[in-house]
Amino acid sequence: YNVFPRTLKWSKMNLTYRIVNYTPDMTHSEVEKAFKKAFKVWSDVTPLNFTRLHDGIADIMISFGIKEHGDFYPFDGPSGLLAHAFPPGPNYGGDAHFDDDETWTSSSKGYNLFLVAAHEFGHSLGLDHSKDPGALMFPIYTYTGKSHFMLPDDDVQGIQSLYGPGDEDPNPKHPKTPDKCDPSLSLDAITSLRGETMIFKDRFFWRLHPQQVDAELFLTKSFWPELPNRIDAAYEHPSHDLIFIFRGRKFWALNGYDILEGYPKKISELGLPKEVKKISAAVHFEDTGKTLLFSGNQVWRYDDTNHIMDKDYPRLIEEDFPGIGDKVDAVYEKNGYIYFFNGPIQFEYSIWSNRIVRVMPANSILWC
């Protein structure tokens, strides 16, 4: 997290806000509900209280405007700048302005007013932008899904550094951004994508370029807004410029940022039995056109060319790949070796000699 220079903050805990005008995109009650919910994000974790005024001067004046709207920080039409807010202080201090050239919504369409407002009110309270891609105060808008919003830990630390904790946090689970060098790190899925490696963990993935050591961290939804926050497995089919992503009983085919029509599909359409609730890991072999799909202690082999499951499957993981354990969290193939991830450990397995040749920490893939 980051606070503004000179640690700008309010010297009182009871703050007022006023909605000066409304966007035509939403009903008045939807707008009021979004702002109320956005303030609650911050009051839940601090001693701050927010009271709405219907007229007069409030600490935080909220308005919608377009282009030049009276503060010498003009908006820019659709997209680009969405909103801005002033840090704590008199006059403009704390005020939040929303660009009415955007389409404001209470859903995933357009820009979600609650999410943008919660971010802007962070500024109104003294938080600057964060470098943590998982933080609400990260400067890039990402719709995080329909489920109950949980304020990330980075933002909690930031706001509590200014105002301290509240009496009781009604939602004490604050998601932490994974630390790539945590020795206990386990991974959810790994796939190549157009020459890069994508390493998925929780609602994030690291993007590793072959000539770089520093992996970039992204929210999965910043790349693919329509995908679930967390995924179970992934593999690339390079000759078709596609990757396949699995979550629960569904899977998606993606070309770059775009989901192919007809997806998601059910994993049972691949020929998996109905009892299989999820795929835990998947890896594709371009030379044979086969894909290994792992679930529980079993492995299936799918023929991507003929679109059928191979006979003689499923088989036990322990029998086909002795020594790697009876589950696979994530897997990828490179230069004749399969890398199996099981908890905080990865096994380098030689396809040629059919044996484990190295055991390494899982996060050595991230150069830790």
Epitope: S79, Y141, T142, S222, F223, N255, G256, Y257, D258
Partner: nanobody, 114 residues
Framework: KVQLVESGGGSVQAGGSLRLSCAAS????????MNWYRQAPGKQREFVAG???????NYAVSVKGRFTISRDNAEGTGYLQMNSLKPEDTAVYYC????????WGLGTQVTVSS
């Protein structure tokens, strides 16, 4: 429906630069990814660069660090700035909106001579 028209192709010496433009007509351009693909004679069409609706970029390994993709949603235009061009960059470059099942331009020829 989106229609795409590429421009900016041409001939250039190795080490030179070109800037390709992709003009889109149709209001849904801003809601789709924007990508550049290329096809060299006798080869398959290959991905070059992509930019999401949220302006996150993705590059083929062979062009990363040399090419830069950008978009201007208000103008309905996408760009590919190509620097340090190599003879192997010679191809017809296609603009794409929305991925493989999306919309395609007719292409613009880029020729890089040594």
């Amino acid at each position: 429906k989106v229609q795409l028209v590429e421009s900016g192709g041409g001939s250039v010496q190795a080490g030179g630069s070109l800037r390709l433009s992709c003009a889109a007509s149709g209001s849904t351009f801003s809601r789709r990814s924007m990508n550049w693909y290329r096809q060299a004679p006798g080869k398959q069409r290959e991905f070059v660069a992509g930019i999401s609706t949220g302006r996150i970029t993705n590059y083929a390994v062979s062009v990363k660090g040399r090419f830069t993709i950008s978009r201007d949603n208000a103008e309905g235009t996408g760009y590919l700035q190509m620097n340090s061009l190599k003879p192997e960059d010679t191809a017809v470059y296609y603009c794409n909106a929305g991925g493989l099942q999306g919309y395609w331009g007719l292409g613009t020829q880029v020729t890089v001579s040594s």
